[in-house]
């Protein structure tokens, strides 16, 4: 058993059929010693008596707000909550795994540039009597300071039958180097608690890995004399870091057709401007990318041909 | 699928101590937990330790638990296996082993999908 | 703790089982051809089976017990298998004390 919060407790079980469970012992935040009664939950029946409280936690029936009090007085609260174990792996039934970019993936992350700001956000079908809460740091064994502000709710989406809620938390690294060669990945940790049931999540990255810039803003096009061919410009997205001579960025230029099935024509350039063919009735799209380190495109800017 | 390189054994003194390293590559070491297994000369297959992927949750045999402290840098893709006041039983073969995933202390071994080569371990006076 | 037979034979081409039956979930299946040598993962998490190895094992469980099944026996399949666990009363793994296989 351990704190989580003040008057929080977890209590971690072995989750099979027959286990014993834990024993657990309760004690009344109190100077009184004498007359002491306890109850769990809403419920009056007097589960024992004395300034301590021994129970067997088996399942969440056994979990819940204990209380003590003395002659109708409520004296102290002690809330249980359960985690479970089942073969060794703690479970993981409050968060949906998001399978990208592979299996077991629970928290999805992004920064927009390296500033040591960003992004993780999570899935659940659960809608109520949830709660979330998000510590990070730089490293684990001397970790340094990483903020985070508190989990929100950030979409709800229908999927099929079920709907599905989406959290968002943002985090900033508290002295982010922005130039500086990454040796500790940043770790995210995250307490879920639904009803009585208690998990944690985690995930651990360097922020070179979840980089996704913006889209490339400023999309124009400019018709080319006498020619099929325009000329198009964009600008670096303002959340990109800076200066963009050493933050750079590489572009993938696209023109795509009004049907899925016509063949795209694309151009790679480290410019900020590129010449294509615009047919009609095409769309010309832009999208950037790190340009010395492999992370993720950017979500495409587009403009019509016409 | 990555592999996992032993290093720090060799002859002992009864009563010291030793550190064992375990160095990944080829894989996303973050994502998993980690155990290590040793075997004695003529003798099966032993949990020593393990560690979850994040270092935070670890586990320890019984026969090491109180000797030994496991911890991991994920930054630099390795595992430490520290083993104080050396016994002459301690004498084995050391191997680093991955699990297939993560959410454990590195004691599922039933989950375990890579080996390290190992490293030999003697402790003698 | 988890029990395994100590040894068991098969001709070459013959198909051989090897239980293992504890109080564990789930189960894997460690191929050691030598004492000191690595051991190589066979079969994982009760039925998984690593991208490397021959798709002449394979692992099932039933209650408390695995089985380990090797369809059309090699030579080069003679080792010492072991069976790995989770030991729920401590919070520790286990293994089995391996079974000999031996083909004729």
């Known amino acids: 058993i351990w704190e989580l919060k003040k008057d929080v407790y977890v209590v971690e079980l072995d989750w099979y059929p027959d286990a014993p469970g834990e024993m657990v012992v309760l004690t009344c935040d109190t100077p009184e010693e004498d007359g002491i009664t306890w109850t769990l939950d809403q419920s009056s029946e007097v589960l024992g008596s004395g300034k301590t409280l021994t129970i067997q936690v088996k399942e969440f029936g056994d979990a819940g707000q204990y209380t003590c009090h003395k002659g109708g007085e409520v004296l102290s609260h002690s809330l249980l909550l359960l985690h479970k174990k089942e073969d060794g792996i703690w479970s993981t039934d409050i968060l949906k795994d998001q399978k990208e970019p592979k299996n077991k993936t629970f928290l999805r992350c992004e920064a927009k540039n390296y500033s040591g700001r960003f992004t993780c956000w999570w899935l659940t079908t659960i809608s109520t009597d949830l709660t979330f809460s998000v510590k990070s740091s730089r490293g684990s064994s001397d970790p340094q300071g990483v903020t985070c502000g508190a989990a929100t709710l950030s979409a709800e989406r229908v999927r099929g039958d079920n709907k599905e809620y989406e959290y968002s938390v943002e985090c900033q690294e508290d002295s982010a180097c922005p130039a500086a060669e990454e040796s500790l990945p940043i770790e995210v940790m995250v307490d879920a608690v639904h009803k009585l049931k208690y998990e944690n999540y985690t995930s651990s990255f360097f922020i070179r890995d979840i980089i996704k810039p913006d889209p490339p803003k400023n999309l124009q096009l400019k018709p080319l004399k006498n020619s099929r061919q325009v000329e198009v410009s964009w600008e670096y997205p303002d959340t990109w870091s800076t200066p963009h001579s050493y933050f750079s960025l590489t572009f993938c230029v696209q023109v795509q057709g009004k049907s899925k099935r016509e063949k795209k024509d694309r151009v790679f350039t480290d410019k900020t401007s590129a010449t294509v063919i615009c047919r009609k009735n095409a769309s010309i799209s832009v999208r950037a990318q790190d340009r010395y380190y492999s992370s993720s495109w950017s979500e495409w800017a587009s403009v019509p041909c016409s | 699928a990555g592999t996992l390189d032993e290093s720090g054994g060799g002859l002992q003194t009864p009563g010291g101590a030793l550190s064992l390293v375990c160095k990944a590559s080829?894989?996303?070491?973050?994502?998993?937990?980690v155990a290590w297994v040793r075997q004695a000369p003529g003798k099966g297959l032993e949990w020593v330790a393990g560690i979850g992927s994040t270092g935070r949750c670890t586990g320890y045999g019984s026969a090491v638990r109180g000797r030994a402290t496991i911890s991991r840098d994920n930054g630099q893709s390795t595992v430490r296996l520290q083993l104080n006041n050396l016994r002459a039983e301690d004498t084995a073969t050391y191997y680093c082993?991955?699990?297939?995933?993560?959410?454990?202390?590195?004691?599922?071994?039933?989950?375990?999908?890579?080996w390290g080569h190992g490293t030999e371990v003697i402790v003698a006076a | 703790g988890l029990t395994q037979p100590s040894s068991v034979s098969a001709n070459p081409g013959g198909t051989v089982e090897i239980t293992c039956s504890g109080s564990?979930?789930?189960y894997g299946w460690y191929q050691q051809k030598s004492p000191g040598s690595a051991p190589v993962t066979v079969i994982y998490q009760n039925d998984k089976r690593p991208s490397d190895i021959p798709s002449r094992f394979s692992g099932s469980k039933s209650g408390s017990t695995a089985t380990l099944t090797i369809t059309g026996v090699r030579a080069e399949d003679e080792a010492v298998y072991y069976c790995g666990g989770y030991d729920r009363s401590n919070s520790s793994g286990l293994f089995g004390a391996g079974t000999t296989l031996t083909v004729l």
């Open positions: 080829g894989f996303s070491f973050r994502s998993y937990d």
């Open positions: 564990s979930g789930s």
């Open positions: 082993a991955k699990e297939s995933g993560s959410g454990g202390c590195g004691w599922a071994i039933y989950r375990i999908d890579a």
